[in-house]
Interface confidence: medium
C-alpha cells in the first residue's frame, strides 16, 4: 500500500477548523498477526529525510495520538482528548486518515506528518508517511476559510518501506 | 529463532560512562522500537526509554534524560545505549527488549540483561 | 507518572490452587484510542521478565490457558487458575497507556 495526501497545502484562518487528511491506497493486510498503527505529529522539512523528527500537536505526541487496529478498520480517538485539546484524529473503512484541530491559532502552522506502519509481527513490515503544511494566517490577508492547494502528483505519494 | 543478544558485565568507576550493545537477530529489526529496562536488586523494573530503529527517533523517561543516550546501528541491527556520570545509583541490571507491536509498549522479547556495577 | 501498585507482594500458594494477584494504577489506564495498555510478565529466578499478558486480557502466544487477565479503568486482576511449579517466581504489571511506561512494583508467588 500506499499513503497520499490529498492535499499539500492547508491555508487556514485564525479560528477555524481544519481537517487534515491522508489516504491509504492500495491493499492493507488483513490478518490476527496483522497490526496497523496510525498516527500524526508535528515535524520540520528535514535535510535527510521529511517527517524524520516528531514533535508534538498542541502538546500531543505521536504515541497519545496514535490509532490501532488491523486491517481497514474504522478508529478514533476520544472525543475527552478533541474537547481537551482541540484536536481527534479518526480512520474509517474506505483507507481515509485524518485529524481535525478546532479552533486554529498562529501556534498551529507547521509541517504535518501522517504515518502508517504495516506489521505483521515481525517477518515483515511496511511504513509510509505523508506529508502536508498548514500555514494559519491572521488579518486581512486571511481568507474567510481554509483554502486547500492539492498535491502534485509527485508529491503526494510519499512512500517509505523498510 | 528470535534473539537479543547483549553485551557482557561491566565494571567501571563513579564518573565514567559506559556503552552496552544489544544485537538483535531472527526479525525485521527497523520493525519495532527497542525498549531499554533497568532492574535494580532483581526487583523493580524502570523503564529507560525507546528508539524507532528505523528514524533513530527517541523516546526518554525523564528520568533518565541526560543520563541515558539511546542509538542503534541499522547495519548491524543493534542498539545501544550509553551510562554517562556513572554513580552508585546506575548499579543495576540492564535489559533490552522488542515492542510486540512496533510501539505500543509491550515487549515480546528480553535481552538476558546486562550487568553494570559501579565502584572505586 | 502513573503509579502501579500490586498486591500482595508476596503469594504463598500451594501447587494445584488458584493464585489471584491484583494491579492498581494511580491513574485510568484507558488510552485516548479507547485501548487499554495493561500487561503482565513472569520473571523468574535468574531470567529476563517474559510477557504473559497484553492489553489486559490476551495471553501472549505459548502462554497456557489457566493464566488470565482482567479489569479496566485502575484495577486489574492477573489469575492463575491451577498453580503449577512452573509458575513460581515474579510478576510484574506494566502500562503503556502514559509515557514514561512504568511497572509495578512485583509479587513473588512461591511454595506454601
Known amino acids: 500500500f500506499k499513503v497520499t495526501t490529498p492535499y499539500s497545502l492547508y491555508v487556514c484562518p485564525e479560528g477555524q477548523n481544519a481537517t487534515l487528511t491522508c489516504r491509504i491506497l492500495g491493499p492493507v493486510s488483513k490478518g490476527h498477526d496483522v497490526t496497523i498503527y496510525k498516527t500524526w505529529y508535528l515535524s520540520s522539512r528535514g535535510e535527510v529525510q521529511m517527517c524524520s523528527e516528531r514533535r508534538p500537536i498542541r502538546n500531543l505526541t505521536f504515541q497519545d495520538l496514535h490509532l490501532h487496529h488491523g486491517g481497514h478498520q474504522a478508529a478514533n480517538t476520544s472525543h475527552d482528548l478533541a474537547q481537551r485539546h482541540g484536536l481527534e484524529s479518526a480512520s474509517d473503512h474506505h483507507g481515509n486518515f485524518s485529524i481535525t484541530m478546532r479552533n486554529l491559532t498562529l501556534l498551529d502552522s507547521g509541517l504535518y506528518c501522517c504515518l502508517v506502519v504495516e506489521i505483521r509481527h515481525h517477518h515483515s513490515e511496511h511504513r509510509v508517511h505523508g506529508a502536508m503544511e498548514l500555514q494559519v494566517q491572521t488579518g486581512k490577508d486571511a481568507p474567510s476559510n481554509c483554502v486547500v492547494y492539492p498535491s502534485s502528483s509527485q508529491d503526494s505519494e510519499n512512500i517509505t518501506a523498510a | 529463532e528470535v534473539q537479543l543478544q547483549q553485551s557482557g558485565p561491566e565494571l567501571e568507576k563513579p564518573g565514567a560512562s559506559v556503552k552496552i550493545s544489544c544485537k538483535a537477530s531472527g526479525y525485521s529489526f527497523t520493525g519495532s522500537n527497542m525498549n531499554w529496562v533497568k532492574q535494580n536488586n532483581g526487583k523493580s523494573l524502570e523503564w529507560i526509554g525507546n528508539?524507532?530503529?528505523?528514524?533513530?527517533?527517541?523516546t526518554y523517561n525523564q528520568k533518565f534524560k541526560g543520563k541515558a543516550t539511546l542509538t542503534v546501528d541499522k547495519s548491524s541491527s543493534t542498539a545501544y545505549m550509553q551510562l554517562k556520570s556513572l554513580t552508585s545509583e546506575d548499579s543495576a541490571v540492564y535489559y533490552c527488549?522488542?515492542?510486540?507491536?512496533?510501539?505500543?509498549?509491550?515487549?515480546?522479547?528480553w535481552g538476558a540483561g546486562t550487568t553494570v556495577t559501579v565502584s572505586s | 507518572d502513573v503509579v502501579m501498585t500490586q498486591t500482595p507482594l508476596s503469594l504463598p500458594v500451594s501447587l494445584g490452587d488458584q493464585a489471584s494477584i491484583s494491579c492498581r494504577s494511580s491513574q485510568s489506564l484507558v488510552h485516548s484510542n479507547g485501548n487499554t495498555y495493561l500487561h503482565w510478565y513472569l520473571q523468574k529466578p535468574g531470567q529476563s521478565p517474559k510477557l504473559l499478558i497484553y492489553k489486559v486480557s490476551n495471553r501472549f502466544s505459548g502462554v497456557p490457558d489457566r493464566f488470565s487477565g482482567s479489569g479496566s479503568g485502575t484495577d486489574f486482576t492477573l489469575k492463575i487458575s491451577r498453580v503449577e511449579a512452573e509458575d513460581l517466581g515474579v510478576y510484574f504489571c506494566?502500562?503503556?497507556?502514559?509515557?514514561?511506561?512504568?511497572f509495578g512494583g512485583g509479587t513473588k508467588l512461591e511454595i506454601k
Open positions: 528508539i524507532d530503529p528505523y528514524y533513530g527517533y527517541t
Open positions: 527488549a522488542r515492542d510486540y507491536d512496533y510501539a505500543l509498549g509491550y515487549f515480546d522479547v
Open positions: 506494566s502500562q503503556s497507556t502514559h509515557v514514561p511506561y512504568t
